[in-house]
């Protein structure tokens, strides 16, 4: 019947959605200093929102324990932030310790579910 | 100047975004059997996409290690799925082993950053 066919289509779509959209780029805040590995610099804001892969993989499959959600495509994006550096006292005028700078952070554009096991036969 | 004010506004917004949107409801696939703690029942689909809290908290703060992203509001939502139960041989006719059923799964509607330490003085 129409209802049975509709239910089958709906269930197939739900099944597909659970596999397809459980490992996707998501918002994470990253500490700029840690991300850029810079010790003696302070940024404002301290943290920025980036897209990183998250979620889970292989739900309902035999190998789900061996599967992780990894970046399949990473791009570097520019962000304009304020950078403060330790100021040194100058003879003439004040040290310029603050500047607007462009920094690059990794953003994950595509996420893949990768499994370290072999596929089930 | 206008440019300085605009930069300040933009940076404040970036700062706010990193705090506001790093702990939010996100897609996760959950195994229905495990979620409902039912051992001898099979569902199709095996897994469904639900909204669960994820991301990170307290980036750039002293206490960030003590902060977790938790559900601030959880709602139960209905999902129509196929349920297969182990069939028993009946005297008259075949056992009805398959049925469309409504199941309830938790969805996180709001996420809060909960920190176990005291706020910094």
């Amino acid at each position: 019947s129409y209802h049975d066919r509709k239910s089958k289509v709906d269930l197939d779509r739900l099944n597909d959605d659970a596999k397809r959209y459980s490992c996707t780029p998501r918002n994470y805040s990253v500490n700029i200093r840690e991300e850029l590995k810079l010790a003696n610099v302070v940024f404002f804001p301290r943290c920025l929102l980036v897209q990183r892969c998250g979620g889970n993989c292989g739900c309902g499959t035999v190998n789900w324990r061996s599967c992780t959600c990894n970046s399949g495509k990473t791009v570097k994006k520019y962000h304009e932030v304020l950078q403060f550096e330790p100021g040194h006292i100058k003879r003439r005028g004040r040290a310029k310790t603050m500047a607007l700078v462009d920094i690059q952070l990794d953003h994950h554009e595509r996420c893949d579910c990768i499994c370290s096991s072999r596929p089930p036969r | 100047s206008y440019h300085d004010r605009k930069s300040k506004v933009d940076l404040d917004r970036l700062n706010d975004d990193a705090k506001r949107y790093s702990c939010t409801p996100r897609n996760y696939s959950v195994n229905i059997r495990e979620e409902l703690k039912l051992a001898n029942v099979v569902f199709f689909p095996r897994c469904l996409l639900v909204q669960r809290c994820g991301g990170n908290c307290g980036c750039g703060t002293v206490n960030w290690r003590s902060c977790t992203c938790n559900s601030g509001k959880t709602v139960k939502k209905y999902h129509e799925v196929l349920q297969f139960e182990p069939g028993h041989i009946k005297r008259r006719g075949r056992a009805k082993t398959m049925a469309l059923v409504d199941i309830q799964l938790d969805h996180h509607e709001r996420c809060d950053c909960i920190c176990s330490s005291r706020p910094p003085r």
């Epitope: 596999k19 397809r20 993989c57 292989g58 499959t61 190998n63 061996s66 599967c67 992780t68 990894n70 970046s71 399949g72 495509k73 893949d112 579910c113 990768i114 499994c115 370290s116 096991s117 072999r118 596929p119 | -």
Partner: antibody
Framework: QVQLVESGGGVVQPGRSLRLSCAAS????????MHWVRQAPGKGLEWVAI????????YYADSVKGRFTVSRDNSKNTLYLQMNSLRAEDTAVYYC????????????????????WGQGTTVTVSS | DIQMTQSPSSLSASVGDRVTITCRAS??????LAWYQQKPGKVPNLLIY???TLQSGVPSRFSGSGSGTDFSLTISSLQPEDVAAYYC?????????FGQGTTVEIK
């Protein structure tokens, strides 16, 4: 049986081009990521490039970026490596190897190393 | 990019000896590590994948362990046919870097 056969190697002058081919048989070629790996005389293995199962994504070693192009024709079960602006340091045996398996029904990539290798084809860049 | 460092670069051992080769990744790669054997004049052959899973057809004297950044390949009892170069490789994302290799010889 599962097999990879490379061809197209030879002696070429610096700055010239060469195209290597790798014919696959015995498996569903269009479900696998495919690699090129090379080995200079007396040296270790060097990963060169990978192409995704569908040809949409390609990644290269820094040493060949901008000079080499990997491609595939799934209808012919064939992998290619177009090598331009060849240098003496590109002299090596070039292997094609089968990489990950992509399960399109579960959207899962199975990464378990390179389990099938071709016999290799020799490229000599010399004036 | 993640670097893979193998040690030692070569070793010589007696038949029956237990031999261990180590591989270190400059950043964590979970268990996405493979080991290959390449006998003189031959094509490389996959020995171990997922850091510790033996490829079918590989003798059980070979074993792998480790996770994250530190990995090892062990031959429990070295045989004459094990004379070869051994390579580790990260296999979770580009670049699929190999270690520089370890040559195993019989004393």
């Amino acid at each position: 049986q599962v097999q990879l056969v490379e061809s197209g190697g030879g002696v070429v002058q610096p700055g010239r081009s060469l195209r290597l081919s790798c014919a696959a048989s015995g498996f569903t070629f269009s479900s696998y990521g495919m690699h090129w790996v090379r080995q200079a005389p007396g040296k270790g293995l060097e990963w060169v490039a990978i192409i995704w199962y569908d040809g949409n994504d390609k990644y290269y070693a820094d040493s060949v970026k901008g000079r080499f192009t990997v491609s595939r024709d799934n209808s012919k079960n064939t992998l290619y490596l177009q090598m331009n602006s060849l240098r003496a340091e590109d002299t090596a045996v070039y292997y094609c190897a089968r990489g990950y398996y992509y399960d399109s029904s579960d959207y899962l990539y199975y990464y378990y190393g390179m389990d099938v290798w071709g016999q290799g084809t020799t490229v000599t860049v010399s004036s | 990019d993640i670097q893979m460092t193998q040690s030692p670069s070569s070793l010589s051992a007696s038949v029956g000896d237990r031999v261990t080769i180590t591989c270190r990744a400059s950043q964590g790669i979970s268990n996405y590590l493979a080991w290959y054997q390449q006998k003189p004049g031959k094509v490389p052959n996959l020995l171990i994948y997922a850091a510790s899973t033996l490829q079918s057809g590989v003798p059980s004297r070979f074993s792998g362990s480790g996770s994250g950044t530190d990995f090892s390949l062990t031959i429990s009892s070295l045989q004459p046919e094990d004379v070869a170069a051994y390579y580790c490789q990260k296999c979770n994302s580009a670049p699929w870097t190999f270690g520089q290799g370890t040559t195993v010889e019989i004393k």
